[in-house]
């Protein structure tokens, strides 16, 4: 006897990182025939949607027109078919950005590095924060967390060409309230010092600090739910 339905998928469009005063839509995808979806915020009921007609709809959207720090936090959703409720979705961490100040980001030895060299990013923010986040832009976005009174170090490497890309950092005032992003730093990785033909497709990062999270883009949304389930909860917890 089945006691619950499979958990729905939850994600944010266009992104789980939302600049303050901007809009965001939380999407919850369950099953066709679901008569009710509930969105929970920080463990409490936040919103309800009853799709019509339920047999033709398997996804609902909860629209937040004006993001602020009160709306930032952990969301989950559930759905109901008849009297049977689903398992709750994974947690979606919705982050408000562009709060207060802008950090500065520098990279050592510089933005142009040689394959095999070790690289360190430094993020600095003079206002009261002790947690920093470094993000690499792209569809498969890597987020690293660092700590320090006014600045944090983010070691990388030895780098391969897979580390090429644009990096930004944020100061974090709490888990769900981040600063403005720093100016971007574009890391260029050139010429192999040694044979790096066996280098992995994607850089490997220390397991305790790195997670892989998919970012939505305005040019198209990835509908692979197995991938969409990787939201930022591991980073932010």
């Amino acid at each position: 006897q089945q006691q619950t339905l499979p958990k729905p998928f939850i994600w944010a469009e266009p992104h789980f990182m939302v600049p303050k005063e901007k809009q965001v839509t939380i999407c919850c995808q369950g099953n066709y025939g679901a008569v009710e979806y509930q969105l929970h915020f920080e463990g409490s009921l936040f919103a309800v949607d009853r799709p019509k007609p339920p047999e033709r709809i398997n996804k609902v959207q909860f629209y937040i027109p004006d993001m602020n720090s009160r709306m930032a936090g952990q969301y989950s959703c559930i759905y109901r078919v008849g009297e049977l409720w689903s398992e709750p979705s994974n947690l979606l961490d919705l982050v408000v950005t562009e709060m207060y100040d802008t950090p500065t980001l520098s990279v050592h030895p510089g933005p142009e590095v040689i394959s095999g060299e070790k690289v360190t990013f430094y993020c600095r923010l003079d206002t009261a924060t002790s947690m920093f986040l470094l993000l690499k832009e792209g569809r498969s976005s890597h987020v690293q967390r660092g700590y320090g009174k006014v600045q944090a170090e983010f070691p990388l490497g030895p780098v391969t060409t897979a580390h090429r890309g644009t990096y930004r950092c944020f100061g974090s005032y709490n888990n769900h309230a981040w600063s403005f992003p720093s100016e971007p730093v574009k890391l260029l990785v050139t010429g192999d010092i040694e044979n790096t033909s066996l280098a992995p497709e994607d850089p490997t990062f220390p397991a305790d600090t790195w997670g892989t999270y998919l970012l939505t883009t305005e040019t198209g949304l990835q509908k692979d739910h197995a991938l969409w389930d990787h939201t930022a909860q591991n980073l932010l917890r």
Partner: antibody, heavy 115, light 107 residues
């Protein structure tokens, strides 16, 4: 070409402070890290710290925290190291070096701490 | 901190001889290693960066290589101006650290 100009020598009293300069030219000052290193007579080199003129981000060798303070003046393309509470142990040659990979080096400033 | 153990601390050699200096890193530094040359007047010049890349203007008789955690500077045929001090420097992990130095003396 890149030049890093440092004063030749300076004599200071024990307990005093001194601010050493490194005037850069021949490259974009704000785009490169500036390192400082110390070399005691007949000894090897020690890294003091570095600073990025564009961001103001600085990083120190734990050994020199409280002893050295790094600053820059971007208007004059000059980097500084401030050494405080000087003792005979601080008598050394102090070098500035440009770039994350220590691409170029100044000629060094000899600091003599003596009463 | 990463320790850079440089050997030998001093080396006597003859003109035209081939010599190698070695630095061993206590932790992985990738290819983030320089070789520096210091003249008797204190002037410091970088010879090699990123383990094996020769700086412009540096004679081809200098070369750098790596085997595991051992990094080497080789001078293929010593000339009179090469009899000075040499240091390795890792810039992989802060604090950046130097080897203890090698004094190259003429035999």
């Amino acid at each position: 070409q890149v030049q890093l100009q440092q004063p030749g020598s300076v004599l200071v009293r024990p307990g005093a402070s001194v601010k050493l300069s490194c005037k850069a030219s021949g490259y974009t000052f704000t785009s490169s890290w500036m390192h400082w290193a110390k070399q005691r007579p007949g000894q090897g080199l020690e890294w003091i710290g570095h600073i990025h003129p564009n961001s103001g981000i600085s990083n120190y060798n734990e050994k020199f925290k409280g002893k050295a303070t790094l600053t820059v003046d971007t208007s004059s393309s000059t980097a500084y190291v401030d050494l405080s509470s000087l003792t005979s142990e601080d008598s050394a040659v102090y070098y500035c070096s440009r770039g994350g990979r220590f691409d170029d080096w100044g000629a060094g400033t000899t600091v003599t701490v003596s009463s | 901190d990463i320790q850079m153990t440089q050997s030998p601390s001093s080396l006597s050699a003859s003109l035209g001889e081939r010599v190698s200096l070695t630095c061993r890193a206590s932790q992985d530094i990738g290819s983030s290693l320089n070789w520096l040359q210091q003249e008797p007047d204190g002037t410091i010049k970088r010879l090699i960066y990123a383990t094996s890349r020769l700086d412009s203007g540096v004679p081809k008789r200098f070369s750098g290589s790596r085997s595991g955690s051992d990094y080497s500077l080789t001078i293929s045929s010593l000339e009179s101006e090469d009899f000075v001090d040499y240091y390795c420097l890792q810039y992989a992990s802060s604090p950046w650290t130097f080897g203890g130095g090698t004094k190259l003396e003429i035999k």
